[in-house]
């Protein structure tokens, strides 16, 4: 399927709107640091290329790759060396390790300002105005906070963003119309960027073969009538679009995604029936949905699964002759039964299969070796059952906050090296899992839960990988993408950790706390309580259940006070004093 | 590269024991069955057990149950076998061999001779 | 048990003839094995999983069978091949081994 000019082709393929954004993400994607307007610079001259290449495909350069293309246009920007430092030796090397260097020096927690929301009457002035340069600044900046954001879906982001400030800029009341809805596009945004990097982590520091074992255990439990064919024939076109995107090849993977969602529209029948209404839709609302469609129903009076993977004669040779193919059918069969099972439990459930068939098929009695596997799967479900339910009791007993807190205490325990900032964040998201998946039924929570857990320690193990402080946080991100949330589960206070020493300016509060809002608050009550644990990470539940009272006792009378600032000064002296005497500090 | 390397040549006492054991390195000792092999000069191979590191099962053919213990240390990457109530019978070269997936033996010690005599 | 039975027990052939032997077993098994071995020395893995050569192994050898007989081919003898072999059968505990082939050169 060669083409003359790949950048023509992709021109032609996505359109030009389309293409102008996909370049515009790919670029902010790789120099997160450059301005808005250095970067619709260089989209507009490559566009203006492409443009030449569509009117002639034998023009100069239009044969050139475009990883080629691309890399030679950021590597014109004057200022990388300043900007970027070692980054810009990565324009001194040639495709294919050029690209690889830009994509080793994007940064999960780039040193950038926090988006900072206008007031509503400056948005919209400033949607009417330009909408073309208000649409491209939102991408630009969404992409460059978020390098591994899944570019089509981005579009389909953006096309939300546009359809907000149309509604709701002629509204009655443009802040009641758009705050609710740019509220749920940043916190639904925050959730896909998370769950695209951990595709990302999956396929770049496990292999493709770990992005497809997840991919069919998902897309069986999806389309749980679909064949094994079928299934393997998604998976790997699935794989190849996100690999794409991963690697920054966007344009590809949007066109290759448009493909998929063709391919899967026009094969319903024998995918799923719950993709009709998805199918109706046009082309970016069509692919998110069929990302987000819901679980077919299972067929039917399914066999039993030890007729073909434990009873067989032939498990051995199957095995033997077609080792992934055997597994993924397991996995196929597996999860195909089980929509009430998390994706990584499937996965550690083929992976205990495989450790199983591995040895039994060299022993002597093959049979009587693995007749017993699936009794070995029993403790594997009923870990994070019963995780799951231990923990929805405590969320409903103490609502989100203090779940969460119960967590920030638990996690920065077993890992206090880690910074402040990532285990607020962290175990924030952590906590929200009650709110999200403690409401559904037994049948539901565990693939609810799990999965988003998986989402969440990602993040952890990127931002720790940027510069890494605990061997324990190390050792849980590397050694299986699918226990990483047993390992650290299974982590217990960290007895070698010499507790931090005791700073008064950390636990010092200003009146500005008062006109933050309640998220914010907490977020800086939790940072003190994260604080308080690195200085005395021996401290009881009840200690710090105390401390914590008081200090929220303390913002509380503060913020009422006339003199709110000398409150803060005066009460503060006398609150870290008690909190030390209470603690033992 | 994989190696097997046996213990040495052993003369005994019957009805006595002795313990031979199999060196393993180049590969990950715990993840493959290491299988026993006995042959009396000119004769032909007879296999007596085998053992997996990773678990410690085992597996014994019922001619040798009694006579041989296959073990194995995980530290030293090592296999053993202990052959006990010694007689002329059990004069032969035993030899280590790793297992692989559908049975076959894929390296071989070089073989102990053992050698009962009063 | 099931008892592999090799034939013939010794065989000679001069160089570049083509030489067979088989291994028959009592009942059924899953996968035949063969081994070469030359005095003095352990047992190689000649060829596995009933058809497939061991690393090293001339491709003028050649496994087949199924069920109870199986057999081995030298499509063009060499002096070199001149050693006992020996089949072993995997799928019935315990795993068993043939008396061997002695093969010679004329």
């Known amino acids: 399927d060669a083409h003359k000019s790949e950048v023509a082709h992709r021109f032609k393929d996505l359109g030009e709107e389309n293409f102008k954004a996909l370049v515009l993400i790919a670029f902010a994607q790789y120099l997160q640091q450059c301005p808005f307007e250095d970067h619709v610079k260089l989209v507009n001259e490559v566009t203006e290329f492409a443009k030449t290449c569509v009117a002639d495909e034998s023009a100069e350069n239009c044969d050139k790759s475009l990883h080629t293309l691309f890399g030679d246009k950021l590597c014109t920007v004057a200022t990388l060396r300043e900007t970027y430092g070692e980054m810009a030796d990565c324009c001194a090397k040639q495709e294919p390790e050029r690209n690889e260097c830009f994509l080793q020096h994007k940064d999960d927690n780039p040193n950038l300002p926090r988006l900072v929301r206008p007031e509503v009457d400056v948005m919209c002035t400033a949607f009417h105005d330009n909408e073309e340069t208000f649409l491209k600044k939102y991408l630009y900046e969404i992409a460059r906070r978020h390098p591994y954001f899944y570019a089509p879906e981005l579009l389909f982001f953006a096309k939300r963003y546009k359809a907000a400030f149309t509604e709701c800029c002629q509204a009655a009341d443009k802040a009641a119309c758009l705050l609710p809805k740019l509220d749920e596009l940043r916190d639904e945004g925050k959730a896909s960027s998370a769950k695209q990097r951990l595709k990302c982590a999956s396929l770049q520091k496990f292999g493709e073969r770990a992005f497809k074992a997840w991919a069919v255990a998902r897309l069986s439990q999806r389309f749980p009538k679909a064949e094994f064919a079928e299934v393997s024939k998604l998976v790997t076109d699935l794989t190849k679009v996100h690999t794409e995107c991963c690697h920054g090849d966007l344009l590809e993977c949007a066109d290759d995604r448009a493909d998929l969602a063709k391919y899967i529209c026009e094969n319903q029948d024998s995918i799923s029936s719950k993709l009709k209404e998805c199918c109706e839709k046009p082309l970016l609302e069509k692919s998110h949905c069929i990302a987000e469609v819901e679980n077919d129903e299972m067929p039917a009076d399914l066999p039993s699964l030890a007729a073909d993977f434990v009873e067989s004669k032939d498990v051995c040779k199957n095995y033997a002759e077609a080792k992934d193919v055997f597994l993924g059918m397991f996995l196929y069969e597996y999860a195909r039964r089980h929509p009430d099972y998390s994706v990584v439990l499937l996965l550690r459930l083929a992976k205990t299969y495989e450790t199983t068939l591995e040895k039994c098929c060299a022993a002597a009695d093959p049979h009587e070796c693995y007749a017993k596997v699936f009794d070995e799967f029993k403790p594997l479900v009923e870990e994070p059952q019963n995780l799951i339910k231990q923990n929805c009791e405590l969320f409903e007993q103490l609502g989100e906050y203090k779940f969460q807190n119960a967590l920030l205490v638990r996690y920065t325990k077993k890992v206090p090296q880690v910074s402040t900032p990532t285990l607020v964040e962290v175990s924030r998201n952590l906590g929200k899992v009650g709110s999200k998946c403690c409401k559904h039924p037994e049948a539901k929570r565990m693939p609810c839960a799990e999965d988003y857990l998986s989402v969440v320690l990602n993040q952890l193990c990127v931002l720790h990988e940027k510069t890494p402080v605990s061997d324990r946080v190390t050792k849980c991100c590397t050694e299986s993408l699918v226990n990483r949330r047993p390992c650290f589960s299974a982590l217990e206070v960290d007895e070698t950790y010499v507790p931090k020493e005791f700073n008064a300016e950390t636990f010092t509060f200003h009146a500005d706390i008062c006109t933050l809002s309640e998220k914010e608050r907490q977020i800086k009550k939790q940072t003190a309580l994260v604080e308080l644990v690195k200085h005395k990470p021996k401290a009881t539940k009840e200690q710090l259940k105390a401390v914590m009272d008081d200090f929220a006792a303390f913002v509380e009378k503060c913020c009422k006070a006339d003199d709110k600032e000398t409150c803060f000064a005066e009460e503060g002296k006398k609150l870290v004093a008690a909190s030390q005497a209470a603690l033992g500090l | 590269q994989v190696q097997l390397q046996q213990s040495g040549a052993e003369l005994v006492r019957p009805g006595s024991s002795v313990k031979i054991s199999c060196k393993a390195s180049?590969?990950?000792?715990?993840?493959?069955?290491m299988n026993w092999v006995k042959q009396r000069p000119g004769q032909g191979l007879e296999w007596i057990g085998q053992?997996?590191?990773?678990?410690?099962?085992?597996y014994y053919n019922g001619r040798f149950k009694g006579k041989a213990t296959i073990t194995a240390d995980k530290s030293p990457t090592t296999a053993y076998m202990q052959l006990s109530s010694l007689t002329s019978e059990d004069s032969a070269v035993y030899v280590c061999?790793?297992?692989?997936?559908?049975?076959?033996?894929?390296?071989w010690g070089q073989g102990t001779t053992l050698t009962v005599s009063s | 048990q099931i008892v592999l039975t090799q034939s013939p027990a010794i065989m000679s052939a001069s160089p570049g003839e083509k030489v067979t032997m088989t291994c028959s077993a009592s009942?059924?098994?899953?996968?035949m094995h063969w081994y070469q071995q030359k005095s003095g020395t352990s047992p190689k893995r000649w060829i596995y999983?009933?058809?497939k050569l061991a690393s090293g192994v001339p491709v003028r050898f050649s496994g087949s069978g199924s069920g109870t007989s199986y057999s081995l081919t030298i499509r063009s003898m060499e002096a070199e091949d001149a050693a006992t072999y020996y089949c072993?059968?995997?799928?019935?505990?315990?795993?068993?081994f043939g008396a061997g082939t002695k093969l010679e050169i004329k």
């Open positions: 072993q059968q995997w799928g019935s505990n315990p795993l068993t």
């Open positions: 061999a790793r297992g692989v997936i559908l049975g076959s033996f894929d390296y």
């Open positions: 053992i997996y590191p990773g678990d410690g099962d085992t």
């Open positions: 180049g590969y990950a000792f715990s993840n493959y069955w």
């Open positions: 009942s059924s098994v899953s996968y």
């Open positions: 999983d009933t058809s």
